[in-house]
């Protein structure tokens, strides 16, 4: 019997995702992997693919936390300067950024059914103890990039070594033994991101290797090129790697939502979260799990599927208008996506020129509001938040690289959907 569309959902790491929902997966030993995008497809499959960062054409690219790829500051015009990810050196072997490998002798308390899984990320080596599944066959095999050996055909996650190496999870089947999450769930705004899958993008092969892992404790340590061991922070019995954030768990109070701690090498730095003094609504509400009060999404003049209060706020975050213009001439399509900001009062326009599905030209311009008002053909398509715009621009950087070398039909249209703010199911953000 065919599953009704409305009932289709995806299960991934004990979490339900709606069809079309996008997120970055949480994978041990890395944590939240911003360089992998997952999407829940219409048939209930989880499709994940690795982000390919474009060469950044500026002198000093900026690494923005929670974004995978480096960005040019203030849409700097191009300079011919290629940026490449740092490789790692460990035990005399050089590993490329994103490469997974196995290490020996790192953990003294390693159990016989555990192995040490390491990965290279931006010049740092991240290693973790991985509990391997019980083997029920005589001749286990090694799988790419996993330190655990598995029985042929085992595992609920099947690998398709096709053109794009997409990794999938079967529809509506819970990955019951997926990685145990010892860290707090990041807020949805940080988890929802990325874009739809691209057959041409290489996936993080083996990133979801061990689908039958028991929920053993994962210890994460970082080793940089100077072989400094143990660059981690330990808080309340949990281990956090450099750059990771969490809300502290204090015995007397439980999880303190209004304090955010970050692991800085081995030192935890905690900051109080400051809530706004004034809210764009009369009666902001306190919601469990959130530090600050939130405005209940009052329905103002709405764009389809969106809820804003009367000052253009969505879930307490300011929204800005997004315009689009599509122009076709001589077999060439020029698509312009524009974001209007108040501070400064200007419009950022992203221009795509595509011929026969191949990206010919992509650039970003900033113009004054006065100039933008002169321009015809721009239609208001939605309002979005700065955080969604950041996700959009990151995705745009990826597909601008990808679509310049192969045919892209709907990638940009799919990406624009990231800007649409959906009304949250349970009435809160």
């Amino acid at each position: 019997e065919q599953v009704k569309h409305s009932e289709t959902y995806c299960m991934f790491q004990d979490k339900k995702y709606r069809v079309g929902e996008r997120w970055h997966p949480y994978l041990e030993p890395y944590g939240l992997v911003y360089c992998v995008n997952c999407i829940c497809s219409e048939n209930g499959n989880v499709l994940c693919s690795r982000v390919r960062c474009p060469n950044v054409h500026c002198l000093s690219p900026v690494h923005i936390p929670h974004l995978c790829c480096p960005r040019c500051p203030d849409s700097l015009p191009p300079v011919n300067n290629k940026v490449t990810s740092k490789s790692c050196e460990y035990n005399g072997t050089t590993y490329q950024h994103g490469e997974l490998f196995v290490a020996e002798g790192l953990f003294q308390n390693r159990q016989p059914n555990q192995c040490t899984q390491c990965s290279c990320s931006e010049g740092n080596v991240y290693c973790g103890l991985k509990t391997c599944p019980k083997l029920t066959c005589a001749f286990p095999v090694s799988v790419p990039d996993s330190c655990c050996r598995v029985c042929r055909g085992d595992g609920e996650l099947s690998w398709e070594h096709s053109d794009g190496d997409i990794f999938r999870q079967p529809a509506n089947r819970e990955a019951r033994h997926s990685y145990h999450r010892s860290h707090y769930d990041p807020p949805p705004s940080r988890q929802a991101g990325g874009l739809s899958r691209f057959p041409g993008a290489r996936s993080h092969r083996g990133a979801l290797m061990d689908s039958q892992q028991a929920s053993g404790t994962i210890v994460q340590i970082v080793i940089n090129n100077k072989h400094k061991h143990g660059q981690v922070c330990v808080s309340n019995g949990k281990t956090y790697s450099h750059g990771e954030s969490w809300h502290p768990n204090l015995r007397a109070f439980g999880i303190v939502e209004c304090v955010l701690c970050t692991c800085n090498v081995t030192k935890q730095e905690c900051k109080k979260i400051h809530c706004p003094n004034r809210y764009p609504c009369k009666y902001p509400q306190k919601i469990d799990g959130k530090c600050c009060k939130v405005c209940p999404g009052k329905k103002a003049k709405e764009l389809p599927g969106q809820s804003f209060d009367n000052k253009g706020y969505f879930c307490g975050e300011e929204t800005m208008p997004v315009y689009e213009s599509v122009f076709m001439e001589d077999g060439e399509t020029t698509r312009k996506i524009a974001l209007e900001t108040e501070r400064p009062p200007q419009v950022e326009v992203h221009v795509w020129t595509i011929r026969k599905g191949i990206l010919q030209h992509f650039h970003i311009e900033k113009i004054s509001k006065r100039m933008f008002e002169e321009l015809p053909h721009f239609k208001l398509v939605t309002r979005t938040t700065l955080s969604q715009w950041k996700i959009f621009t990151e995705g745009e950087a990826q597909i601008s690289q990808m679509c310049s070398s192969r045919v892209c039909r709907t990638e940009l249209e799919d990406l624009v959907k990231v800007l649409y703010l959906e009304r949250s199911e349970k009435g809160h953000c």
Epitope: P77, A338, M371
Partner: antibody
Framework: QVQLQQPGTELVKPGASVKLSCKAS????????MHWVKQRPGQGLERIGN????????NYNEKFKNKATLTVDKSSSTAYMQLSSLTSEDSAVYYC??????????????WGQGTTLTVSS | DIQMTQSPASLAASVGETVTITCRAS??????LAWYQQKQGKSPQLLIY???TLEDGVPSRFSGSGSGTQYSMQINTMQPEDTATYFC?????????FGAGTKLELK
């Protein structure tokens, strides 16, 4: 190839009006902004205004709002600029210029040869 | 309107020399800047747009750079045919405004 053709000279009396033309060829006339630029002898360049040939909507620099009127004739792919109440201050070279389509900022990639307007009695 | 201050007003350079012309905007123009070349008795020609993008057919000895309110154009080996007046133009706000021009002559 893209061409913007303008008459070389116009001689008119003070107080009169003149209609300068700019005939476009080699591209889709209605797809690109057309701008008009003034250059007085030995001086800099000033944009007078621009027109969207598709809709006929024109925008003017404040300074030229009561001086210039921009129009188009789509059938002949021609842009026009009418200058009224002419004085010696209006004696200048007037250029029509097209702006690039894949940029929103106005970058003038093709220019006419210019019409030298002389206002003299 | 945004004011564009161009300098120098004129200069003379020998063949092979490097020439730099600068332009200052009265406010941030976020890279929306173009450079035009106008030879005696001719109409202007677009050389560089969006701060540093060379228009098709423009020799690679021409280059542009800058950000915020400060921009410049460089000719890295002056040629006799580069004798002309050069104008910068901001395209960030309306109306687009030009600099007063720099007259470049051959020494």
């Amino acid at each position: 190839q893209v061409q913007l053709q303008q008459p070389g000279t116009e001689l008119v009396k003070p107080g009169a009006s003149v209609k300068l033309s700019c005939k476009a060829s080699g591209y889709t006339f209605t797809s690109y902004w057309m701008h008009w630029v003034k250059q007085r002898p030995g001086q800099g360049l000033e944009r007078i205004g621009n027109i969207n040939p598709s809709s006929g909507v024109a925008n003017y620099n404040e300074k030229f709002k009561n001086k210039a009127t921009l129009t188009v004739d789509k059938s002949s792919s021609t842009a026009y600029m009418q200058l009224s109440s002419l004085t010696s201050e209006d004696s200048a070279v007037y250029y029509c210029a097209r702006s690039k389509s894949n940029y929103v900022a106005y970058y003038f990639d093709y220019w006419g040869q210019g019409t030298t307007l002389t206002v003299s009695s | 309107d945004i004011q564009m201050t161009q300098s120098p007003a004129s200069l003379a350079a020998s063949v092979g020399e490097t020439v730099t012309i600068t332009c200052r905007a009265s406010e941030n123009i976020y890279y929306s800047l173009a450079w035009y070349q106008q030879k005696q008795g001719k109409s202007p020609q677009l050389l560089i747009y969006h701060t540093n993008t060379l228009e098709d057919g423009v020799p690679s000895r021409f280059s542009g750079s800058g950000s915020g309110t400060q921009y410049s154009m460089q000719i890295n080996t002056m040629q006799p045919e580069d004798t002309a007046t050069y104008f910068c133009k901001q395209a960030y706000d309306v109306p687009p405004t030009f600099g007063a021009g720099t007259k470049l002559e051959l020494k």
